[in-house]
């Protein structure tokens, strides 16, 4: 739903985008996902800031947490419990890495409206969350884990080694963070809150990563992190399990690894409970391309967990790396052994497969030249999953039901015809046993969110469909986009192309190509954005194009995995073919073409720049890596092996962008960096700018003090502000 | 009024096994988790084994791990200690306890008087 | 397993006075504490839990205090029946501990 394209009699009063537009904020669009607290019920902070209670079935609401409430403590989060009878009020944000943060909590009784005195909590804390059900709460402070069975009980203290820097007890460590989990937190309730499982990380051995954080003070501090470089020593984790009930007749129980992934180093990749005694761990071996899911049972005699052989399924990947970006999870059946699980299939897809006994004889429940993306929710009856299938582009996402409670399973998409041309890219979110759902549509039309009756499909209503984002568009001159492929050598090619509101296929354009590239990473997608880009395309009159080439995802193993040991080769290839192609449609002016991308972004463009191809005339890299082995073991091994002699070191050596100072003589650098990035250190930056001066190649170089690897705030404005004049510069375009 | 009655007590060879019992009146006996905590003649208590008012959770101190097994029969309010291989160090007066302090507190609020099991050749 | 140390080992006084029994534990307990007297020859009685709250029947000169790994249990004028020997328990941990117990004997 773009606003429709006007005739010329109307466009003086419609203006292009500006500068000022996006770093505003002014075309945000806004997501409505409920928060589930029943089949039928759900929570929403409303604009107002009440947390407000709405039943769907008897369309009633009411408020069950007051702004009022929320503005004592200053909460910019809350939590109920699920037997309703608290409510957790998160205060005093303080962002850490990219999910955690530390927070005070506040407990408030909603039987009395009062907040619990007595036994309050500790402050800051790291993580906390309810058990599944009643009032149970676990949190983790000072690395250390503790339980309460009731709000206003005093705490049991489950940990007692957790150290700072040194061992992490419910919370991953940097590289678990950022690399495997993805979360904050690495503690699981089992489904009734009898059992809490956790994860120790020992990082005693782990290289420290050190920068200065300059601050206000006279002495800059040490900012020092645990982070293992590909090769270095790994964290060292153990998964352990405590009976929340009688937390002192038993103590943490140890839960086996499996003998075939315990002879050499590995990883723990996630953990999924089955039942309140059954529980299934998922491993990884260090080099990434054998995984094992692990289904282990409670013994109660014992007080123990036991993890038989007969259920251990291995997932091997010979081509690549186990899984996508990362090994998949599994989603159990209701007979609490048999699970759904996305992995490749016989022609290199990701599909759904139903395992029952073995890995062997799973049964393979999609297929096709397209891959299943994520399953949501499965049911006595259905199988929700979102898959690229639908009329062959891999950059739309539509939600689909199976049913599995029939022979043969009957398969209905349930998004493709909803609002065609406005919603090709879903999510969901379920309610409980799917009773009702949620969808939510990016694009490329402009977002909406809506309700949906889980058995019948229907549309209930409208949750949010962003009409002040539409109306404010109508006098906005939008540029055109279009999502189209390339065929060269056997390799498909898609691309999104913005283009200027007026753009005239016979006149010439300046072509800045932006790039991500990293390995299972989909740029191409059909999503609705106002963006730097858009700006670009509407007021200054580029062609902006993003390619997704080799390693990128969701379009088979073969162009997944044609990248695996070999990171900065076919990437950076395939975006030099892509601008030849473009070129050869005729409206692309070949004198001014640039390349800019942001991390592994930064990574392909400056390699692209450095490709002594003479294509582009300048281009940008904001935090980019420079070399495979300053960055994280986790990602970087994945897809590189290791930095050995008897392993990959050769092509670690060789995939350096210092290695190809000499290149960049021809073209104008720019490279950006945060002194601060955590994540791709600014050590990335200052062995290119090293390299460059040792070469003596000039550059452009601009730094961000004590900014991390998203350069937010008022960093970001100047990072825009200050790579468009680069680009106007580059492109001889008048400010 | 609560109580508690040990029984199954004496001179017990090494490697013996005698069964300790406990009868339980006065409270509603599978709403409770149960104990037997033991003293050694002169020494101080510790726990040995608790078992939960269902009968589904039996945990153990590592002393006696696989060698003594917790039971209770709820239809006759009655609780069991059966104990094997035992050796001199065993020798205790065992005291079945009921839990007290309901949030979870491993607490023992009512006790019986003891019955003494002495290991000896 | 957390240990849990008494002192003093024994202590003597007389009938009227204040009595303190200190508690300390290696590694944090939280609340989670309870102290009981025993006689000879009798069984353990609970006199206190969660660290401060008295069980019902104990009298009020009986109060307890302290969190973490510092407990102390105090008898605010020592009756007859109240000589004999105290044991602290620690409820947090598995396994649950008792303090090695603090003998309090007539002066």
């Known amino acids: 739903l773009r606003p429709p394209r006007v005739h010329n009699s109307e466009e003086n009063t419609m203006r292009a985008l500006t500068l000022k537009d996006i770093l505003n904020g002014t075309f945000s669009y806004k997501t409505f996902f409920p928060n589930w607290i029943s089949g039928q019920e759900y929570l929403h902070q409303s604009a107002d800031n009440n947390i407000v209670l709405y039943n769907i079935e008897t369309g009633q609401s009411y408020t069950i947490l007051s702004n009022r409430t929320m503005k004592s403590v200053n909460a910019s989060n809350y939590g109920l419990s699920p037997d309703r009878q608290f409510v957790y009020l998160e205060s005093d944000y303080s962002k850490l890495w990219r999910y955690s943060y530390t927070a005070t909590y506040y407990i408030y009784d909603l039987s009395n409206g009062e907040f619990v005195r007595g036994n309050e909590l500790p402050r800051p804390i790291q993580y906390l969350c309810w058990s599944p059900v009643g009032s149970k709460l676990a949190y983790v402070y000072q690395n250390n884990i503790y339980l309460k069975q009731r709000p206003g009980d005093p705490p049991f203290q489950i940990t007692f080694n957790g150290r700072e820097n040194k061992i992490f007890n419910g919370i991953p460590d940097w590289v678990y963070e950022e690399e495997m989990l993805a979360t904050k937190y690495a503690l699981w309730w089992s489904p009734n809150g009898k059992f809490l499982a956790y994860a120790e990380f020992n990082d005693t051995d782990i290289p420290v990563i050190a920068y200065s954080y300059y601050g206000d003070e006279q002495y800059p501090r040490t900012i020092n992190i645990p982070y293992p470089k590909a090769g270095a020593k790994n964290p060292f984790v153990r998964i352990f399990i405590i009976d929340t009930t009688y937390p002192a007749y038993v103590g943490p129980q140890e839960v086996p690894v499996p003998a075939m992934i315990a002879s050499s180093d590995y990883y723990f990749s996630w953990l999924t409970w089955v039942t309140d005694e059954r529980v299934c761990l998922q491993w990884l071996k260090r080099v990434q391309n054998v995984s094992v899911l692990s289904i282990c049972d409670f013994r109660e005699d014992w007080q123990t967990w036991d993890c038989p052989k007969t259920q251990e399924h291995i997932e091997e990947s010979r081509t690549g790396w186990a899984g996508g970006f990362f090994v998949s999870t599994p989603v159990f059946s209701y007979d609490a052994i048999s699970y759904y699980k996305i992995f490749s299939d016989k022609d290199g897809y990701k599909h759904i497969h139903y395992i029952k006994d073995t890995v062997e004889n799973a049964i393979q429940i999609t297929s096709g030249k397209w891959e299943a993306i994520n399953i949501f929710r499965v049911t006595q009856d259905s199988l929700f999953y979102s898959s690229n299938e639908f009329e062959d582009y891999p950059g739309r996402r539509n939600i689909y039901r199976i049913s599995i409670g029939s022979y043969p399973p009957s398969k209905k998409c349930v998004t493709c015809h909803l609002r065609k041309e406005r919603c090709q890219y879903y999510t969901a979110s379920f309610s409980d046993y799917a009773k009702y759902y949620a969808l939510v549509c990016y694009g490329p039309g402009i977002p909406i969110s809506t309700l949906h009756d889980g058995r019948t499909d229907q549309e209930i209503k409208i949750l949010e469909e962003n009409k002040e984002l539409e109306n404010a568009l109508k006098n906005i001159q939008l540029p055109k986009e279009e999502i189209k492929k390339l065929e060269v050598d056997e390799i498909t090619l898609w691309y999104k192309m913005i283009l200027p509101p007026q753009f005239d296929r016979s006149k010439k354009y300046p072509l800045l190509i932006q790039v991500y590239g990293g390995p299972c990473s989909q740029s191409v997608r059909s999503v609705f954005a106002v963006n730097w880009i858009s700006y670009l395309a509407s007021k200054e009159g580029m062609v902006i194009a993003l390619v997704d080439g080799r390693g990128t995802a969701f379009q088979g193993d073969k162009l997944l995995y044609a990248v695996y040991r070999k990171l900065g080769v076919y990437e950076v290839e395939d975006q030099i073919t892509a601008v030849r192609k473009f070129i050869e449609m005729g409206f692309i002016d070949e004198k001014r073409i640039a390349i800019w991308g942001w991390s592994y972004g930064g990574y392909v463009s400056s390699l692209a720049l450095a490709s002594g191809t003479g294509l582009f005339k300048c281009g940008i890299a904001v935090a980019p890596v420079s070399s495979w082995e300053y960055y994280a073991s986790v990602y970087t091994e994945r897809f590189m092996g290791l930095p050995t002699k008897d392993d990959n070191l050769e092509h670690y050596k060789n995939s350096t962008v210092m290695a190809r100072a000499e290149y960049f003589r021809n073209v104008d650098y720019l490279l950006i960096h945060g002194t601060a990035d955590d994540n791709v250190h600014f050590q990335n930056s200052a062995q290119i700018a090293k390299a460059l001066v040792n070469a003596q190649v000039d550059f452009q170089a601009m730094w961000y003090s004590d900014q991390n690897h998203g350069l937010s705030g008022l960093s970001t404005n100047h990072l825009y502000t200050h790579m468009t004049h680069f680009l106007k510069q580059c492109f001889s375009l008048s400010d | 009024e609560v109580q508690l009655l040990e029984s199954g007590g004496g001179l017990v060879q090494p490697g013996g096994s005698p069964r300790l019992s406990c009868e339980a009146s006065g409270f509603t006996f599978s709403s409770y988790a149960l104990s037997w905590v033991r003293q050694a003649p002169g020494k101080g208590l510790e726990w040995v084994s608790a078992?939960?008012?269902?009968?589904?959770?039996?945990y153990y101190a590592d002393s006696v791990k696989g060698r003594f097994t917790i039971s209770r029969d709820n239809s006759k309010n009655t609780l069991f200690l059966q104990m094997n291989s035992l050796r001199a160090e065993d020798t205790a007066v065992y005291y079945c306890?009921?839990?007290?302090?309901?949030?979870?507190?491993?607490?023992?609020?009512?006790w019986g008087q003891g019955t003494l099991v002495t290991v000896s050749s | 397993a957390i240990q849990m140390t008494q002192s003093p080992s024994s202590v003597s006084a007389s009938v009227g006075d204040r009595v303190t029994i200190t508690c300390r534990a290696s590694?944090?307990?939280?609340?989670?504490l309870a102290w009981y007297q025993q006689k000879p020859g009798r069984a353990p009685k609970l006199l206190i839990y969660?660290?401060?709250t008295l069980q019902s029947g104990v009298p009020s000169r009986f109060s307890g205090s302290g969190s973490g790994t510092d407990f102390t249990l105090t008898i605010n004028s020592l009756q007859p029946e109240d000589f004999a020997t105290y044991y602290c328990q620690q409820a947090n941990s598995f396994p649950p501990t008792f303090g090695q117990g603090t003998r309090l004997e007539m002066k």
């Open positions: 969660v660290a401060s």
């Open positions: 078992i939960s008012g269902s009968g589904g959770g039996r």
């Open positions: 306890a009921k839990e007290g302090y309901s949030s979870s507190g491993t607490y023992w609020d009512h």
């Open positions: 590694q944090g307990v939280s609340s989670w």
